[in-house]
């Protein structure tokens, strides 16, 4: 029983992040313009991984797709390729892990096959989750990156008589809902982990062997033997410890500009 | 068609208060930001102050900040100007206006209410 | 505040030919995000309110007759009417729509020769 809420709970877990990740990759807030500098300002700026987008006050917001791939950054190519391995692997683990769900029966498919296919899974799910962490992470670090470069930059162009203000950029509402996204799913690949040592077939039972002792019409037979896992008593009514690991959702609040403006 | 139509105005005592309307139609009046614009006898345009369209941001020139407030009732599809501690430099024909249009532009104004500060 | 600076205050043209008014900003207007400048012209005819002219500092509003150009970029910006009309004798403003309060320039009274 405890396998099963593992295993669905796993699933269930994997889903919400993968939803996560593949929101956090179309979102279009990847970066918003810092206001610390400028507060008042009636045109917002915000960039995703496929277009730059700018709100003005009016309510009119105008985007922009960046229709070219060779001159783009090789970051964000490689945050954009990360997101997508991230979700292809994602896609795959769900499909896989329905099929290896305990709770649906599809024909005599044995447990060990159930036990092979939540592995796969999982480590799909892990692979995953570490795909969106990474690609947030990098983005992340772009933009911190070049938020001091241009920081630099405004303190040293302040010569002239007119002043230039800079657009610098900071993290978008996106990377939370990446990093956050890509934690679940990585959390549920390690429950279908977890889950799947609770379907394998762990039991090998030798078959009874009579010893005839002499003068004695008494056959022995020991008990069956124990394939050397390291966990305890009969497979068919086996426990494991279902932890309950638990993520408290932050919901991480940043300027948000006007209404657009 | 856009109409705004502003209302409110009059003659009050350095040290009053007034409160200018604006009643707007023709358009989704709670999805634009909406300003109030004024004009000095024989002076330049001088914006006032500007409110998003759900009321989150709000904007006042330094020379009413403190004094003037702004509101909008979005259900009414009224713009509203409070203006309070009114001095003799307050003296003008207040417009409403929206950015209707793209580039935070001021493509709709309304024909003016006059407002006069003396004793 | 971005200050803007109008030039001429006043300006006299005679009928069909060009006439051209600076404005000038203390800040830059110019948005990177859209590469568009933040600035808007209005005309204002005698006793009546206030017209769009052009928005983002060279588009047009539709409508409005091709005599008038808006160019310039950053913190320089200019309007032109290329061939004068009567019905063009107006005050004209113009606007920053980057960073609040949305100053307005003083205005330049063009009047016919």
């Known amino acids: 029983m405890a396998v099963t809420a593992c295993q669905g709970l796993g699933f269930v877990v994997s889903l919400i992040g993968i939803a996560g990740i593949i929101a956090a990759t179309c979102m279009d807030q990847w970066s918003t313009q810092d206001l610390y500098n400028n507060p008042v300002t009636a045109v917002f700026n915000y960039q995703g991984l496929w277009r730059s987008c700018v709100r003005e006050s009016s309510g009119f917001t105008e985007c922009r797709g960046y229709f070219t791939l060779l001159g783009l950054p090789a970051m964000l190519q490689a945050v954009r390729a990360l997101m997508i391995v991230g979700i292809v692997l994602g896609a795959i683990g769900l499909l896989v892990s329905i099929f290896a769900l305990k709770c649906i029966r599809i024909g005599s498919m044995e447990d060990s096959a159930k036990a092979n296919m939540t592995l796969t899974s999982g480590i799909m799910f892990i692979v995953s989750g570490l795909c969106a962490i990474a690609g947030v992470s990098v983005f992340a670090n772009m933009l911190v990156t070049n938020f001091w470069m241009s920081t630099a930059n405004m303190y040293t162009g302040m010569g002239g008589m007119v002043q230039t203000v800079q657009t610098r950029y900071t993290f978008g509402a996106a990377l939370f809902v990446g990093w956050v996204a890509g934690g679940l799913t990585l959390i549920g690949g390690v429950m279908m982990c977890i889950a799947c040592r609770g379907l394998a077939p762990e039991e090998t039972n030798y078959k009874a062997v009579s010893y005839h002792a002499s003068g004695h019409s008494v056959a022995y037979k020991p008990g069956g033997f124990k394939a050397s896992t390291g966990f305890g008593s009969n497979t068919k009514n086996k426990k494991i410890y279902d932890g309950g690991a638990r993520t408290e959702d932050e919901v991480q609040s940043y300027p948000s500009k006007h209404d657009y403006v | 068609e856009v109409q705004l139509v502003e209302s409110g105005g009059g003659l009050v005592q350095p040290g009053g208060s007034l409160r200018l309307s604006c009643a707007a139609s023709?358009?989704?009046?709670?999805?634009?930001?909406m300003h109030w614009v004024r004009q000095a006898p024989g002076k330049g345009l001088e914006w006032v102050s500007y409110?998003?369209?759900?009321?989150?941001?709000?904007y006042y020139a330094d020379t009413v900040k403190g004094r003037f407030t702004i509101s909008r009732d979005n259900a009414k599809n009224s713009l509203y100007l409070q203006m309070n501690s009114l001095r003799a430099e307050d003296t003008a024909v207040y417009y409403c206006?929206?950015?209707?249009?793209?580039?935070?532009?001021?493509?709709?104004w309304g024909q003016g209410t006059t407002v006069t500060v003396s004793s | 505040d971005v200050v803007l600076t109008q030039s001429p205050d006043s300006l006299a043209v005679s009928l069909g030919e060009r006439a051209t008014i600076s404005c000038k900003s203390s800040?830059?207007?110019?948005?990177?995000?859209?590469?568009?400048?933040?600035l808007t012209w209005y005309q204002q005819k005698p006793g009546q309110t206030p017209t769009l002219l052009i928005y983002?500092?060279?588009t047009r509003k539709s409508g409005v007759p091709d005599r008038f150009t808006g160019s310039g970029s950053g913190t320089d910006f200019t309007l032109t009417i290329s061939s004068l009309q009567a019905e063009d004798v107006a005050v004209y403003y113009c606007?920053?729509?980057?960073?609040?309060?949305?100053?307005f320039g003083a205005g330049t009274k063009v009047e016919i020769k």
């Open positions: 206006a929206t950015s209707y249009y793209y580039g935070n532009a001021l493509e709709y």
């Open positions: 023709g358009f989704t009046f709670s999805s634009f930001g």
């Open positions: 409110i998003s369209s759900g009321s989150g941001s709000i």
């Open positions: 800040q830059s207007l110019f948005n990177v995000g859209n590469q568009k400048n933040y």
């Open positions: 983002w500092a060279s």
């Open positions: 606007q920053n729509v980057y960073s609040y309060p949305l100053t």
